[in-house]
Interface confidence: medium
């Protein structure tokens, strides 16, 4: 079996110019392509992988929401030579998320990593964005986490930072087929420079206080202390799955056999994000571009 091969990390890795083909190992009988797109209120980007796969032919589309961070995943496996070029992996511009200017800043600022490399998303070096409330959702928390896509024996990962609806989430995550978006939230401007080591204690959960042993001559303290030892588990309702994006049509025939122009975009939306002018077009970044299978 021969499959297309490429890796895209919010760049042009799968653009029309950069396409490669690979011969699969004996016993491998499916080609795979997977795309994961992440949207924050300040932009969007995508990860994508094409290559030799494993498992059965088929499609799996999923939409996810993590405290206002949206993720859209499409996984497609097929059993014909070079059949894994059906999903449109075009990276599109990181446009502002719709009518951004129509919303007044709510006073919170967060570091924003949308399609940035891990090097560019270190500490306080990423750009700072002003959070705003959209569609009756309050974005007053800051998020620091990662998105990971695994397919064709390849794992690609990028950092994600931005404004979210929760200020206290700790190591929360949502998963889809070969896809994970996870991280932590915090309260206060620019608090998301590094939340990798955030513990489960937050202003909502009084910390466990160790009191000195009472001295025989004094009255025991009457301070109320919460001694819960297990970390609270956030209810799953906060990470609700979203409707699956519309299904992808197969590659166009004859005239468009050598064209990607009319392949539909990965689409989807979620409550609170309809205002975004680009919410129905994925992947998004400037990416890449169609990615670059460097065309000739």
């Amino acid at each position: 079996l021969e499959c297309y091969s490429c890796v895209q990390k919010a760049d042009d890795g799968c653009s029309p110019n950069k396409m490669k083909t690979v011969k699969c190992a004996p016993g491998v009988d499916v080609c795979t392509e997977a795309v994961g797109a992440v949207e924050t209120i300040h932009g969007q980007f995508s990860l994508a992988v094409r290559g030799c796969g494993s498992g059965l032919p088929g499609k799996n589309d999923r939409g996810l929401d993590l405290h206002g961070l949206l993720a859209f995943i499409q996984l497609q496996q097929c059993a014909q030579d070079r059949c894994n070029a059906k999903l449109n992996l075009t990276s599109r511009a990181l446009d502002p998320a719709g009518n951004e200017s129509a919303y007044p800043p709510n006073g919170v600022e967060c570091y924003s990593c949308v399609g940035l490399s891990r090097e560019a998303c270190q500490g306080t070096s990423p750009p700072v964005v002003s959070c705003y409330n959209a569609s009756d959702h309050v974005y007053k928390g800051c998020f620091d986490g990662n998105v990971t896509l695994t397919a064709a024996n390849v794992t690609v990962s990028l950092p994600v930072r931005g404004c979210v609806q929760d200020e206290f989430c700790t190591r929360d995550g949502v998963t889809g087929p070969g896809f994970t978006l996870s991280g932590s939230c915090c309260q206060g401007s620019r608090c998301n420079s590094d939340l990798r080591n955030k513990t489960y204690f937050s202003p909502r959960i009084p910390p466990l206080v160790r009191l000195p042993p009472p001295e025989p001559t004094t009255v025991a303290s009457t301070t109320s202390v919460t001694t819960s030892t297990s970390a609270p588990v956030r209810p799953t309702s906060t990470t609700k799955p979203m409707p699956a994006p519309t299904s992808q049509t197969p590659r166009q025939g004859v005239e468009h056999e050598a064209s990607r122009d009319e392949e539909p975009r990965l689409t989807g939306g979620a409550a609170g994000h309809q205002d975004r002018s680009n919410s129905g077009q994925y992947p998004a970044k400037g990416g890449p571009q169609q990615p670059h299978n460097k065309g000739c």
Epitope: S5, D12, S15, P16, N17, K18, M19, K20, T21, V22, R82, A85, N88, T90, S91, R92, A93, L94, R251, H256, E257, A258, S259, R260, D261, E262, E263, K285, G286, G287, P288, Q289, Q290, H292, N293, K294, G295, C296
Partner: antibody, heavy 117, light 111 residues
């Protein structure tokens, strides 16, 4: 039917500027990567520049980097190539081409740019 | 000097089979990038003939075929016809140059 129509070529002096246009029709222009490819008289093909569907990513051959700028107006279905600091070696027929499934699958008829004093 | 190397000329008689080679390197064809072939008839714009190593766009006769192996590729034309007289170019992406590269072109003459 897919059509690409270049315009804007002509005679220009060394150091001068020229702006080429490529009007596209018959396909969803805003979804297509586009390129400029040139061919000097009696010579082979040379890729010049390409641009992503949204216009956010641009790439250039080393020979034109810093002098040429590719851009697009998706609302007008038009691709542009702004050429500055032109040199004699930039003399060529400039073709606008659509990038399809990994290849330049549609080409315009070309427009001739002559750089001479 | 082109990044991809093609013979400057080739010839054949009607009905014959002709092969045009295209030699690259580890930064282009050898890196796994797909190879394309273009036909340029005299006085006209290039036309996509073969894409993706061996795929024919609709309208291209099956007399034209492409193949790729290692760092090189080839275009075969069987049942040569007079209207096949043209310049043929191979192309592929090049990692080092971060862009598409073309061969120098092969002028095919039908004797």
């Amino acid at each position: 039917e897919v059509q690409l129509l270049e315009s804007g070529g002509g005679l220009v002096q060394p150091g001068g500027s020229l702006r080429l246009s490529c009007a596209a029709s018959g396909f969803t222009f805003s979804s297509a990567w586009m390129s400029w490819v040139r061919q000097a008289p009696g010579k082979g093909l040379e890729w010049v520049s390409y641009i992503s569907s949204s216009g956010s990513s641009t790439y250039y051959a080393d020979s034109v980097k810093g002098r040429f700028t590719i851009s697009r107006d998706n609302s007008k279905n038009t691709l542009y190539l702004q050429m500055n600091s032109l040199r004699a070696e930039d003399t060529a027929v400039y073709y606008c081409a659509r990038e399809g499934l990994w290849a330049f699958d549609k080409w315009g008829q070309g427009t001739l740019v002559t750089v001479s004093s | 000097q082109s990044v991809l190397t093609q013979p400057p000329s080739a010839s054949g008689t009607p009905g014959q089979r002709v092969t045009i080679s295209c030699s690259g390197s580890s930064s282009n064809i050898g890196a796994g990038y797909v190879v394309h072939w273009y036909q340029q008839l005299p006085g006209t714009a290039p036309k996509l003939l073969i894409y993706d190593n061996n795929q024919r766009p609709s309208g291209v006769p099956d007399r034209f075929s492409g193949s790729k192996s290692g760092t090189s590729a080839s275009l075969a034309i069987s049942g040569l016809r007079s209207e096949d007289e043209a310049d043929y170019y191979c192309a592929a992406f090049d990692d080092r140059l971060s862009g598409p590269v073309f061969g120098g072109g092969t002028k095919l003459t039908v004797l």
